[in-house]
């Protein structure tokens, strides 16, 4: 039961995390105008991975997409790539993990297959979470660098009485959403990997005992899942039994009233 709970919780946490990664990737507030030097601005700027926006104090907002691909900074392209890879891996991981869930029965899928799928999805979630965290961190580093550079240049070349205040950008909400979402996906992935260990059958090896009964030979074979898949070419006079040990969790083949699909 603990393994099912761990797997289910891992799936839910990863699902929330990936939803967060998608949300962060789509959000426009990756960087927002720093209002420290100009708290009374009537025009507020913020930027995302795909477009930049200007919100006027009158309430009107205008957003413009980055319609160039080659003209964009390499770092921004890298962040986009990391986030997209994170989303794709996470989506595949979710798909795999749905079929790996113990509470969902698909045909006569063996527990070893479910264990492998759980591990695969867990690894995918971990990589997805790392991609998101890396993407957000690269962007944050880019912001910090630009922030201090623009601070240094803020009042240079003023010349006369006219003051030109350079717009500085600071961390936007999307960065925090991305960090949290990446962390959740990572945690979900780790939980899936932990659940995989509980799902994997313990292969207890017994000595093969063969005895002859009247007219029929019955072989008791060791090897857990390897003994038979149920689709073997069994001869008429020979029965093959699964002699493997089952864990407490594996006894529950069908969903109980506490497991929801």
């Amino acid at each position: 039961m603990a393994v099912t709970a761990c797997q289910g919780l891992g799936f839910v946490v990863s699902l929330i995390g990936i939803a967060g990664i998608i949300a962060a990737t789509c959000m426009d507030q990756w960087s927002t105008q720093d209002l420290y030097n100009n708290p009374v601005t009537a025009v507020f700027n913020y930027q995302g991975l795909w477009r930049s926006c200007v919100r006027e104090s009158s309430g009107f907002t205008e957003c413009r997409g980055y319609f160039t691909l080659l003209g964009l900074p390499a770092m921004l392209q890298a962040v986009r790539a990391l986030m997209i890879v994170g989303i794709v891996l996470g989506a595949i991981g979710l798909l795999v993990s749905i079929f790996a869930l113990k509470c969902i029965r698909i045909g006569s899928m063996e527990d070893s297959a479910k264990a492998n799928m759980t591990l695969t999805s867990g690894i995918m979630f971990i990589v997805s979470g790392l991609c998101a965290i890396a993407g957000v961190s690269v962007f944050a580093n880019m912001l910090v660098t630009n922030f201090w550079m623009s601070t240094a240049n803020m009042y240079t070349g003023m010349g006369g009485m006219v003051q030109t205040v350079q717009t500085r950008y600071t961390f936007g909400a999307a960065l925090f959403v991305g960090w949290v979402a990446g962390g959740l996906t990572l945690i979900g992935g780790v939980m899936m990997c932990i659940a995989c260990r509980g799902l994997a059958p313990e292969e207890t090896n017994y000595k093969a005992v063969s005895y002859h009964a009247s007219g029929h030979s019955v072989a008791y074979k060791p090897g857990g899942f390897k003994a038979s898949t149920g689709f073997g070419s069994n001869t008429k006079n020979k029965k093959i039994y699964d002699g493997g040990a089952r864990t407490e969790d594996e006894v529950q083949s069908y969903p109980s009233k506490h497991d929801y699909v």
Partner: antibody, heavy 118, light 113 residues
Framework: QVQLVQSGAEVKKPGASVKVSCKAS????????MNWVRQAPGQRLEWMGQ????????KYNGNFKGRVTITRDTSASTAYMELSSLRSEDTAVYYC???????????WGQGTLVTVSS | DIVMTQSPDSLAVSLGERATMNCKSS????????????LTWYQQKPGQPPKLLIY???TRDSGVPDRFSGSGSGTDFTLTISSVQAEDVAVYYC?????????FGGGTKVEIK
């Protein structure tokens, strides 16, 4: 069509308060900031403050040192501007104006003359 | 506060002539986010409230004749009336729409010679 109709002229004594109203029609009153701008005789226009009728959020010009209070009654689509501790230099025409794209004032009331005299 | 300085104080032109007036701000009104200048021009005729002419330094409001045009960027702006008509006699104000408090210029009075 958009219309902003202001209350009539007022004569006040120094130290008193005045409350000017501005009734809006022809648009969604709650969705646009309403501003108050005054113009003293022979002087430039001076922005006093604004209110967002949707939630009552306000912004004021600090030069008025807290003497201005802007309120609204959304059910009546009316904005109000109250100026307290009146002085003779507060004698001016007071306008309400709708805030629009580009942070400009696209529609103005006809103006309310407030005279402060002892 | 941003100080808006208009010049000249008054301008006398003949009908059909070109009228040009200037507005200078103490700070740049150019927003880097959308590369727009947050400067507005108004026309005020005697006994009337101001009327919006141009916003974003060069965008004409709907219904404004195309003889009115705005130009400039950063701190220096110009309003041009290409061919002055009798109904253009008014005071023209520029406004900072970039930073609170929103401030206005002292105005330029346009008269007919």
């Amino acid at each position: 069509q958009v219309q902003l109709v202001q209350s009539g002229a007022e004569v006040k004594k120094p130290g008193a308060s005045v409350k000017v109203s501005c009734k809006a029609s022809g648009y969604a009153f709650s969705n646009y900031w309403m501003n108050w701008v005054r113009q003293a005789p022979g002087q430039r226009l001076e922005w006093m403050g604004q209110i967002y009728p949707g939630n009552g959020d306000t912004k004021y010009n600090g030069n008025f040192k807290g003497r201005v209070t802007i309120t609204r009654d959304t059910s009546a689509s009316t904005a109000y501007m109250e100026l307290s501790s009146l002085r003779s230099e507060d004698t001016a025409v007071y306008y309400c104006a709708r805030y629009y794209r580009g942070n400009c004032f696209d529609y103005w009331g006809q103006g309310t003359l407030v005279t402060v005299s002892s | 506060d941003i100080v808006m300085t208009q010049s000249p104080d008054s301008l006398a032109v003949s009908l059909g002539e070109r009228a040009t007036m200037n507005c200078k701000s103490s700070q740049s009104l150019l927003n880097s986010g959308n590369q727009k200048n947050y400067l507005t021009w108004y026309q005020q005729k005697p006994g009337q409230p101001p009327k919006l002419l141009i916003y974003w330094a060069s965008t004409r409001d709907s219904g404004v004749p195309d003889r009115f045009s705005g130009s400039g960027s950063g701190t220096d702006f110009t309003l041009t009336i290409s061919s002055v008509q009798a109904e253009d006699v008014a005071v023209y104000y520029c406004q900072n729409a970039y930073t609170y408090p929103l401030t206005f210029g002292g105005g330029t009075k346009v008269e007919i010679k």
